[in-house]
């Protein structure tokens, strides 16, 4: 037991306040914004991270406005309601009483309505497609090396079980990472694919959520993999319910 161990911080979430006042001097960390206790041995849920992000000083906030692709998160940041486990509540509302239903990754899956809108259950996002374009390199990356490196990244950095990384596709300069995780497959203690994808997204943008760790330094056989754009597509176990007006827009 050395002095180096006596630092009460949350290695997996820098958006926390920690103090060693738990039972027996255990380090206990609470997420900013919600004040909820977080488990620092694993990833913090995306809902609590978004809430913490919204509680940060305004000048530190960078609004994310992804491009207008049908299945991506076009709504950007909002201050979500999280349940006692830190998951998104199925119904989200803003300060002007506009409400909508979200999936398990917090992405809107219905038209916006008023306070009478009902969202019966939190629909699980079971398939996430992360679409990356890398910066030009001297030559294409070796597909199997790239595949191995990305799988290693999700296993080691995000602690996502390898079975949930369904595939890695590559057609220079596009890389696609498929994450799949059905409700029945997710055991207690398993990292959620939505949380892993969010940590990856923030890493790629140079906004790492990890405490004191360097930013993401992705290399394939020593060659830096620099991403110049990211799109994330979410597929739910139950299809979303948008009006025809939106679908034809």
């Amino acid at each position: 037991h050395t002095a180096a161990q006596d630092n009460c911080t949350c290695p997996t979430n820098k958006m926390t306040v920690c103090s060693p006042d738990g039972p027996g001097g255990r380090c206990q960390c609470r997420a900013l914004g919600s004040g909820m206790a977080v488990d620092c041995s694993t990833l913090t849920s995306k809902c609590l991270l978004l809430k913490a992000r919204m509680s940060a000083p305004k000048n530190a906030r960078t609004l994310v406005r992804p491009s207008e692709h049908a299945l991506v998160d076009n709504d950007g940041l909002y201050d979500p309601d999280c349940d006692p486990e830190g998951r998104f509540k199925a119904r989200q509302c803003n300060q002007t009483s506009v409400c909508w239903c979200v999936n398990s990754v917090g992405v809107r899956r219905t038209d916006k309505g008023d306070l009478s809108l009902r969202c019966d259950e939190l629909v699980r996002t079971h398939h996430i497609l992360i679409d990356l374009r890398h910066r030009p390199t001297a030559g294409a990356f070796n597909h199997s090396d790239l595949d191995a490196e990305l799988r290693r990244l999700f296993r080691e950095r995000y602690r996502l079980h390898p079975k949930f990384v369904a595939a890695v596709h590559y057609e220079q300069p596009t890389i696609q990472i498929e994450l799949r995780q059905n409700t029945s497959q997710k055991a207690a203690g398993d990292v959620d694919i939505g949380d892993a994808a969010y940590y990856f997204e923030r890493d790629i943008k140079g906004e790492s959520l990890f405490q004191g760790r360097g930013g993401l330094d992705l290399r394939v056989r020593g060659e830096p993999l620099q991403v110049e754009r990211t799109l994330i597509y979410y597929l739910d176990e139950i299809p979303p319910k948008f009006s025809m007006k939106r679908l034809t827009a």
Epitope: D6, S19, P20, D21, G25
Partner: antibody, heavy 116, light 107 residues
Amino acid sequence: QVQLQQSGPEVVKPGASVKMSCRASGYRFTDYVINWVKQRTGQGLEWIGQIYPGSDSFHYNKNFKGKATLTADKSSNTAYMQLNSLTSEDSAVYFCARFFEGFAYWGQGTLVTVSA
Amino acid sequence: DIKMTQSPSSMYAFLGERVTITCKASQGINNYLSWFQLKPGKSPKSLIYRANRLVDGVPSRFSGSGSGQDYSLTISSLDYEDMGIYYCLQYDEFPLTFGGGTKLELK
């Protein structure tokens, strides 16, 4: 190095109160919790409570609520425990301990004898 | 409150013998378990924390193991200075609770 120096033995009358001290040195007092533990002769260890000088937050064993009061003086790096309405059941050695993640540095103990 | 049941309550062992003391929690305690040694007239001494982490300066003959509700302290080769009373402590939740103790004596 970390040291916890506890006050000397006390002989007190039934019904009286006693306040013992635990002076910390070798570390930043406000960074760690102080726990108090009771050991009666021939019996086991019993947890009394915990105080965190960093925020003056505390937790008590329900068996000691009303019996023990924990305080901390940041200016002198000293934790205190006051025991009220003493009976023969309170005759024991009381230890203070600095805890972090279940690892503890212990004081040498304060012997309290309740005797008419 | 979490009840810690420690066994045996007392035991005799030879020098050089392998000794194991167990602690069972009334519910899972997520490895938040410490072991202490207490000798007459002395302060308790921390041996193990987080179920299996050895405190600096404690001889490597001491080791801790277990998970869930069941934990153990093992002394691989008993030394004369290991005589005393051993206690487990759970710090998974308040109130902290100790086991009843195991008195270890020389055979």
